[in-house]
């Protein structure tokens, strides 16, 4: 098992990140999220399933989630739209976008990332770079400060063997290598960025963490531009 | 601040059964693990098992399958731990510990006719 | 499943003395935790992943270890130290505890 952040990774390097968003309930981190326009975060539709009841908000301009930095800022939440064809029980179109009460105030720690528009799947190989405040061993540890991790891009017929997911990825998700390096338990609707481009999302779906033969699984948001565009309009 | 509330002692009796309470404060249990932990009188510290609230999966050391259930309410932050079947070897201080980081104060479970 | 040996299981030093407490696995491990429990409180978190400082945990206590053999060191032991110490490891399921060390001041 994984000794690092992330699983297996390393902190990141304080506001080289400035997409970089956490999605908070009732004041405490839940999830990732990725800053794609100036009042909008793409997150994991699955991250507020049970938080009807909750205070949602977004964290932007953040390193470590604990301590004041000039550039940090905590923005209610004035729309959240979970992709209609998102259900608790699936892994599929779990996106999320949340509107912020008002446009995010950008500066270098807070810039919203550019999106990949071209439904073209990654190339395998391809090192990718995933960030997030999501748990760092299998203890459950959760990190103060922003973590990240380089894996590379898996190719969706070796994610798909029945050793792995079996058939579960289809051609709007896609995969990485997960061994001993992974996205895990809190990462999810994080940014999975692959040639500064944003190219998936970490999926919220239960998955086990480090384990080479269940890879992570993230939604291709090339896939989905239609919807995105749609809502941001 | 990161707070882990637990219920309150319990004698109970033989072959009875108890569920005892876990409630945080300062943090979402479905961004991490809950863990309980049983430390009998005058000894070791044994791990149970532990839950992710997230989705209920749960995975529990062998010895404590079918004694322990470990569950969890993200609505209310809360984990648990209920005790079947109850025998005087069960009588222990049980705690809760998210991420085995931070740890409930521990209830005291008292099994005697 | 993995069994953890700690030792010794009590021992004693005196105020300022270097302590080192070891916990060895019946196979090899990745990493380990290590705790200290004072009679009536819950045990509190000193080194995680093998290594990494607990938050608020003073900086005498340090932990090193690989494969099968791990260890706490205490670089001065001071009265507050007077504890028990047990390790876990976080590698195999079932996650087990060692047996823990008894540590008195002299």
């Known amino acids: 098992p994984p000794r690092g952040r992330i699983l297996g990774g390393r902190e990141a390097e304080a506001h080289a990140r400035p997409y970089m968003a956490s999605v908070q309930l009732n004041g405490a981190h839940l999830c990732g999220g990725v800053l794609v326009a100036e009042q909008w975060v793409l997150s994991a539709a699955h991250c507020l399933e049970d938080a009807a009841d909750g205070k949602v908000q977004v964290l932007l301009g953040a390193h470590s989630l604990s301590q004041p930095e000039p550039s940090k800022r905590l923005y209610d939440v004035l729309r959240a739209v979970p992709h209609p064809d998102s259900q608790p029980d699936t892994i599929d179109h779990d996106l999320l976008l949340l509107q912020l009460s008002e446009k995010a105030t950008l500066g270098p720690a807070v810039r919203p990332l550019p999106w990949q528009r071209v439904d073209r799947d990654v190339a395998p190989g391809t090192l990718c770079d995933v960030a997030g405040w999501g748990i760092v061993n299998h203890a459950g540890r959760r990190p103060d400060s922003l973590q990240h991790v380089l894996l590379p891009v898996l190719d969706r017929a070796t994610c798909n063997r029945r050793t792995h997911h079996d058939g579960a990825i289809t051609e709007r998700l896609m995969c990485a290598e997960s061994n001993r390096r992974d996205s895990c338990k809190g990462d999810s609707g994080g940014p999975l960025v692959c040639g500064g481009v944003l190219e998936g999302v970490v999926t919220s779906g239960s998955r086990v963490c480090g384990n080479r033969k269940k890879p992570g699984i993230y939604t291709r948001v090339a896939s989905y531009a239609a919807w995105i565009d749609s809502v941001l309009a | 601040e990161v707070q882990l509330q637990q219920s309150g002692a319990d004698l109970v009796k033989p072959g009875a059964s108890v569920k005892l309470s876990c409630t945080a404060s300062?943090?979402?249990?479905?961004?991490?693990?809950m863990h309980w932990v049983r430390q009998r009188p005058e000894k070791g510290l044994e791990w149970i098992g532990r839950?992710?609230?997230?989705?209920?999966?749960?995975i529990y050391d062998p010895q404590f399958q079918g004694k322990a259930t470990i569950t969890s309410d993200t609505s209310s932050n809360t984990a648990y731990l209920q005790l079947n079947s109850l025998t005087s070897e069960d009588t222990a201080v049980y705690y809760c510990?998210?991420?085995?980081?931070?740890w409930g104060q521990g209830t005291s479970v008292t099994v005697s006719s | 499943q993995i069994v953890l040996t700690q030792s010794p299981a009590i021992m004693s030093a005196s105020p300022g003395e270097k302590v080192t407490l070891t916990c060895s696995a019946t196979?090899?491990?990745?990493?380990m935790y290590w705790y200290q429990q004072k009679p009536g409180s819950s045990p509190r978190l000193l080194i995680y992943?093998?290594?990494n400082l607990a938050s608020g945990v003073p900086v005498r206590f340090s932990g090193s270890g690989s494969g099968t053999s791990y260890s706490l060191t205490i670089s001065r032991m001071e009265a507050e130290d007077d504890a028990t110490y047990y390790c876990?490891?976080?590698?195999?399921?079932?996650?087990?505890f060692g047996g823990g060390t008894k540590l008195e001041i002299k």
């Open positions: 196979s090899s491990v990745s990493y």
């Open positions: 992943d093998t290594s």
């Open positions: 839950i992710d609230p997230a989705n209920g999966h749960t």
């Open positions: 300062g943090f979402n249990i479905k961004a991490t693990y």
């Open positions: 510990a998210e991420a085995m980081d931070y």
């Open positions: 876990q490891q976080w590698s195999n399921y079932p996650f087990t």
